[in-house]
């Protein structure tokens, strides 16, 4: 018996508007009905929770109103979008999946997605 496998892309480049999207896919050992997904960021030996959502299979992911994350679920796949990113937010973003109900509980952690964020150059002043 091993830890639940979680797959996510190795690298993602955020858009010029500071938006990054990636898929987090998990190999469910059972028929979970309640799943918790947490996005963690590891950078400079610090680990912070970016966002988290608990959802019922077949329903939408619901993050807190002030969350920088949005997402949708389809089967054992979660499509995550993180907004408002700046260059200083570059780091390794890890998908943590917990099968909460019914028992038994399972935990899986992905190998992380390195998200690169490049702040856009300011527009030059126009003479017009």
């Amino acid at each position: 018996c091993k830890a639940m496998h979680v797959a996510q892309p190795a690298v993602v480049l955020a858009s010029s508007r500071g938006i990054a999207s990636f898929v987090c896919e998990y190999a469910s050992p059972g028929k979970a009905t309640e799943v918790r997904v947490t996005v963690l960021r590891q950078a400079d030996s610090q680990v912070t929770e970016v966002c988290a959502a608990t959802y019922m299979m077949g329903n939408e992911l619901t993050f807190l109103d002030d969350s920088i994350c949005t997402g949708t679920s389809s089967g054992n796949q979660v499509n995550l979008t993180i907004q408002g990113l700046r260059a200083m937010d570059t780091g390794l973003y890890i998908c943590k999946v917990e099968l909460m109900y019914p028992p038994p509980y399972y935990l899986g952690i992905g190998n992380g997605t390195q998200i690169y964020v490049i702040d856009p150059e300011p527009c030059p002043d126009s003479d017009f």
């Epitope: 018996c1 091993k2 830890a3 639940m4 947490t38 963690l40 590891q42 030996s45 610090q46 680990v47 912070t48 929770e49 390794l92 890890i94 943590k96 917990e98 038994p104 509980y105 935990l107 899986g108 952690i109 190998n111 992380g112």
Partner: nanobody, 127 residues
């Protein structure tokens, strides 16, 4: 699936020793980091120590006093606590995390990476 059960808490005088055990069933410990955490009343849960196949890590507050070890034949992780102080009084929890290549000495004990939390065992250091 992994199931963890901890034991060994109790009341001890300052300067005394205790050994906590965390026994795993349902899986070998090999692919996991096992961590010890503690929570004092009114405070956040904090890292004490953790161990994987090749590395150990400790919170600064317990370095030199606590020792973590694992016995793979018994599927058990131990936390030997010596020179106990009043400030070590807390509920102690054992938890597991899948061992990942990106874990560093500084991050492998981070509580965000853990699950399979035990119910906790009370450790009270008092005269």
């Amino acid at each position: 699936e992994v199931q963890l059960v901890e034991s060994g808490g109790g009341l001890v005088q300052p300067g005394g020793s205790l050994r906590l055990s965390c026994a795993a069933s349902g899986s070998t410990l090999d692919p996991f980091v096992i961590g010890w955490f503690r929570q004092a009343p009114g405070k956040e849960r904090e890292t004490v120590s953790c161990i994987n196949r090749s590395r150990t890590s400790y919170a600064d507050s317990v370095k030199g006093r606590f020792t973590i070890s694992r016995d793979n034949s018994k599927n058990t992780v131990y936390l030997q606590m010596n020179s106990l102080r009043a400030e070590d009084t807390a509920v102690y929890y054992c938890a597991a995390s899948p061992d990942k290549p990106f874990y560093t000495d500084q991050t492998m004990c981070n509580k965000h990476y853990y699950g399979y939390w035990t119910q906790g065992t009370q450790v009270t250091v008092s005269s």
